[in-house]
Interface confidence: low
């Protein structure tokens, strides 16, 4: 389904159209798709409107370690990367772009996954890492959330909202020390209730690129600089999750 060809995976990060990334992508300026208007106060203006998180905790409030959710796959079912020496430097800091092998993908087993879902990223994230999430939006969906987590901080919160004051909007933000920062908002909204989707997040040296259904959507400049410490991706919201995986490109 992902029509990637990884045998010639790139080792550099200068190519704006890396293998496996939507080909329509051009050289977007940093922050493309982000809200260009006024800087918002540091408080989180999107704070849980009533019903915004039906039956679940707000983003970032994932209890416990992977497998803490009832019915979630037990820890260890995620196929890990090769254990050969040097694959992950002991400090967790990749020694080079190739520190994650360009084979894979690694991640969750295929088949329906329990949401909320945690995808471990054992060595953090590094440039040229491509995370792919496949699923189907539930009928009458309210929200989707991806949370790239560094401990209790959320380095990158990607939050499509299907009905915020009767509007559909994608909100991106970062949470540090329990405080949300300035929101970046995008009104281009490629998700549809009841329909399948593919979200791809490509890690670049200074930003995350996000594509949905093979079309570039936005990019989000890194606010958390220690990429190697972003060790978990939380996936939540009104979706049926089919798979979540990552690979190097």
């Amino acid at each position: 389904a992902d029509n990637f060809s990884l045998h010639d995976a790139l080792s550099g990060s200068g190519n704006p159209n890396p293998q496996g990334w939507p080909g329509a992508w051009g050289n977007q300026p940093a922050g493309a798709g982000g809200y260009p208007g006024a800087s918002y106060p540091g408080a989180y203006p999107g704070q849980a409107p009533p019903g915004a998180y039906p039956g679940q905790a707000p983003p970032g409030a994932y209890p416990g370690a992977p497998g803490a959710y009832p019915g979630a796959p037990a820890p260890g079912v995620y196929p890990g990367p090769p254990s050969g020496p040097g694959a992950y430097p002991s400090s967790g800091q990749p020694s080079a772009t190739g520190a994650y092998p360009a084979t894979g993908p690694y991640g969750a087993p295929a088949g329906p996954l329990i949401v909320p879902y945690n995808l471990p990223l054992p060595g953090g994230v590094v440039p040229r890492m491509l995370i792919t999430i496949l699923g189907t939006v539930k009928p009458n969906a309210n929200r989707i959330a991806l949370d790239f987590q560094r401990g209790n901080d959320v380095a990158f919160h990607f939050n499509p909202r299907f009905n915020e004051n009767n509007r559909r909007v994608i909100v991106c933000n970062t949470k540090l020390d329990n405080n949300w920062g300035r929101e970046e908002r995008q009104s281009v909204f490629p998700f549809e209730s009841g329909k399948p989707f593919k979200i791809q997040v490509l890690v670049e040296p200074d930003h995350f690129k996000v594509a949905v259904n093979d079309a570039h959507l936005l990019q989000y400049n890194h606010r958390v600089k220690k990429l190697n410490e972003i060790s978990k991706l939380g996936i939540s919201g009104d979706i049926d999750l089919t798979s979540a995986s990552y690979t190097m490109i």
């Epitope: 493309a32 798709g33 809200y35 260009p36 208007g37 006024a38 918002y40 203006p45 999107g46 409107p49 009533p50 019903g51 915020e164 004051n165 009767n166 509007r167 559909r168 909007v169 929101e183 970046e184 908002r185 995008q186 009104s187 281009v188 909204f189």
Partner: antibody, heavy 120, light 110 residues
């Protein structure tokens, strides 16, 4: 500089038609909801219509439904308001307004307005 | 078209604080629909002062604050200054995806 410039306002007879335009610059026009808001002389603000970035979600105030049509051309960074069956009570300054990316209600960029006068 | 209810006018002296109310219904202000406030000087376009009930855009003085309780929103201006003399409008989304404005409040600085 983020800017909205309206044009097309003029004197028109009751029952007539007019098309207002709004040229946007300084921001990624296709990302944001846009609105038309009007203000009759000496009166308050009155929201007319809104359109989202992809032209998929369009809303109108009851008093203009069936008479006014909002549209946009993202390639031209332009917003339009086609006004038909104009009435004397449509006389007002018409503002082109960007909704802030935070869609909780804030309209953060306003044009200077264009005056529409409906009179025989 | 329903209109949010604001007092026609309020007044205050320099340095004082004033509050302007904006009464709606459960279909607009009270229905989890966020309120914004605008300032308009004569002959000028409106300016966004508060969005999402209580948040200030950058560049707006922290003398302006917003709040909401039930079906009523409020704008408070502290430390009144001469340049605050203007018309103030509240606005909200409504349950049918429209927007609605209040009738406006004229602030007079004595």
């Amino acid at each position: 500089e983020v800017q909205l410039v309206e044009s097309g306002g003029s004197l028109v007879k009751p029952g007539g038609s007019l098309r207002l335009s709004c040229a946007a610059s300084g921001f990624t026009f296709s990302n944001d909801d846009m609105n038309w808001v009007r203000q009759a002389p000496g009166k308050g603000l009155e929201w007319i219509s809104s359109i989202d970035g992809s032209s998929r979600s369009i809303y109108y105030a009851d008093f203009v439904k069936g008479r006014f049509t909002i549209s946009r051309d993202n390639a031209k960074n332009s917003l339009y308001l086609q006004m038909n069956s104009l009435r004397a009570e449509d006389t007002a300054v018409y503002y082109c307004v960007r909704s802030s990316g935070y869609s909780g209600g804030g309209m953060d960029v306003w044009g200077r307005g264009t005056l529409v006068t409906v009179s025989s | 078209q329903s209109v949010l209810t604001q007092p026609a006018s309020v007044s205050g002296s320099p340095g004082q604080s004033i509050t302007i109310s904006c009464a709606g219904t459960s279909s607009d202000v009270g229905g989890s629909y966020n309120v914004a406030w605008y300032q308009q000087h004569p002959g000028k376009a409106p300016k966004l002062m508060i969005y999402s009930d209580s948040y200030r855009p950058s560049g707006v003085s922290n003398r302006f604050s917003g709040s909401k309780s039930g079906n009523t929103a409020s704008l408070t201006i502290s430390g009144l200054q001469a340049e605050d003399e203007a018309d103030y409008y509240c606005s909200s989304y409504t349950s049918n995806s429209a927007r609605v404005f209040g009738g406006g409040t004229k602030l007079e600085i004595k």
